[in-house]
Interface confidence: low
């Protein structure tokens, strides 16, 4: 599996999408786990609803949510209020029994918020935007980052 990079801005939300073959994974619950070290175990963060037919219902664990479009074949993970410690390697998984197939390996990168970067030499003009906190994400603007694309640069 290649690793797909998703970048988000600190303090914003990042949406990670994991496409899969809906027929091949029919009836299977999904999970989002964090890789502990290069060859370590993948620690479960959150999984879809216990009833597969209700997989579309968003489930939260802390600031992480998961929802599964089982017909369209897209698992979506939302990391809310992204923080530097959220950066790291993750996996989208398809569960069957005690086994788990990797749907996608994901590298989450957390960037400073370019739109809310204040610096002695370059002040923002808050009057222009009520909350830069909602602004986009740096390299990759928060919300959802396109695979391989690096959205925002910072501004200090």
């Amino acid at each position: 599996h290649n690793t797909t990079v998703f970048q988000g801005v600190a303090g914003q939300s990042l949406q990670v999408s994991c496409p899969y073959d809906s027929m091949k994974h029919w009836g299977r619950r999904k999970a989002w786990c964090r890789q502990l070290g290069e060859k370590g175990p993948c620690q479960r963060v959150v999984s879809t609803h216990n009833l597969w037919l209700l997989s579309f219902l968003r489930r939260w664990n802390g600031s992480t949510a998961i929802t599964d479009d089982t017909l369209g074949g897209t698992l979506t993970i939302t990391l809310r209020n992204l923080q530097p410690h959220d950066a790291g390697l993750y996996q989208c998984q398809s569960l069957h029994g005690s086994e788990a197939d990797t749907l996608r390996k994901v590298l989450v990168e957390v960037l400073a918020d370019p739109l809310d970067h204040r610096d002695a030499g370059d002040l923002w003009f808050p009057g222009e935007s009520e909350s830069f906190e909602d602004a986009h994400v740096e390299h990759s603007i928060s919300r959802s980052l396109l695979e391989g694309e690096i959205p925002f640069p910072p501004t200090s």
């Epitope: 909350s131 909602d134 694309e149």
Partner: antibody, heavy 118, light 112 residues
């Protein structure tokens, strides 16, 4: 692929307002990134004017702050530039561009020439 | 604002030659996160600027490897190892480390 297209009047009278539209296809302006206006004066000098981010936040070049407004119509996937009280100094080719963070301005429109003249 | 100073303003070259363009910023372009947001664009006659190099030294997709970028802090260089006819145009450096994004004045690469 993402495409940006500027449109608007090519001639504006001094003291009036300049209004341009950037129509984006192939990507939703509410998904990510910052959507910018940049202008190029005769002689090639480029000036960043401002942007509206996917969330609707705006940031403007301080040199234009009192005259500029960037807004959007998410239903049409368009964003707009309004520059008030124009003078002949505002004659330029106006570009809209998507700011991709690490990549800077990776996608540009083809530009539209606006002449300010009586 | 951060002032970007490009030299030379005009660069006459022969096809196949190496070309070098310098860009200097009035303040450091190293962002608080450690990245340096200095980019290079090429504008061919009648076209909009196109991204060549991002973050100092990374070639954008589809950009030939004869283009290379280097530098740090406030001093940056774009090099073209073997100039081809399609490389002619105006080159701009630009910074997006600081909120008011700024561009260099441009360097026109032309045939000697």
């Amino acid at each position: 692929d993402v495409q940006l297209q500027e449109s608007g009047p090519g001639l504006v009278k001094p003291s009036q307002s300049l209004s341009l539209t950037c129509t984006v296809t192939g990507y939703s302006i509410t998904s990510d990134y910052a959507w910018n206006w940049i202008r190029q004066f005769p002689g090639n000098r480029l000036e960043w004017m401002g942007y509206i981010s996917f969330s609707g936040s705006t940031s403007y070049n301080p040199s234009l702050k009192s005259r500029i407004s960037i807004t959007r119509d998410t239903s049409k996937n368009q964003f707009f530039l309004q520059l008030n009280s124009v003078t002949t100094e505002d004659t330029a080719t106006y570009y809209c561009a998507r700011w991709n963070g690490n990549y800077g301005f990776a996608y540009w429109g083809q530009g539209t020439l606006v002449t300010v003249s009586a | 604002d951060v002032v970007m100073t490009q030299t030379p303003l005009s660069l006459p070259v022969s096809l196949g030659d190496q070309a070098s363009i310098s860009c200097r910023s009035s303040q450091s372009l190293v962002h608080i996160n450690g990245n340096t947001y200095l980019h290079w664009y090429l504008q061919k006659p009648g076209q909009s600027p196109k991204l060549l190099i991002y973050k100092v030294s990374n070639r954008f997709s589809g950009v030939p490897d004869r283009f290379s970028g280097s530098g740090s802090g406030t001093d940056f260089t774009l090099k073209i190892s073997r100039v081809e006819a399609e490389d002619l145009g105006v080159y701009f450096c630009s910074q997006s480390t600081h909120v008011t994004f700024t561009f260099g004045s441009g360097t026109k690469l032309e045939i000697k």
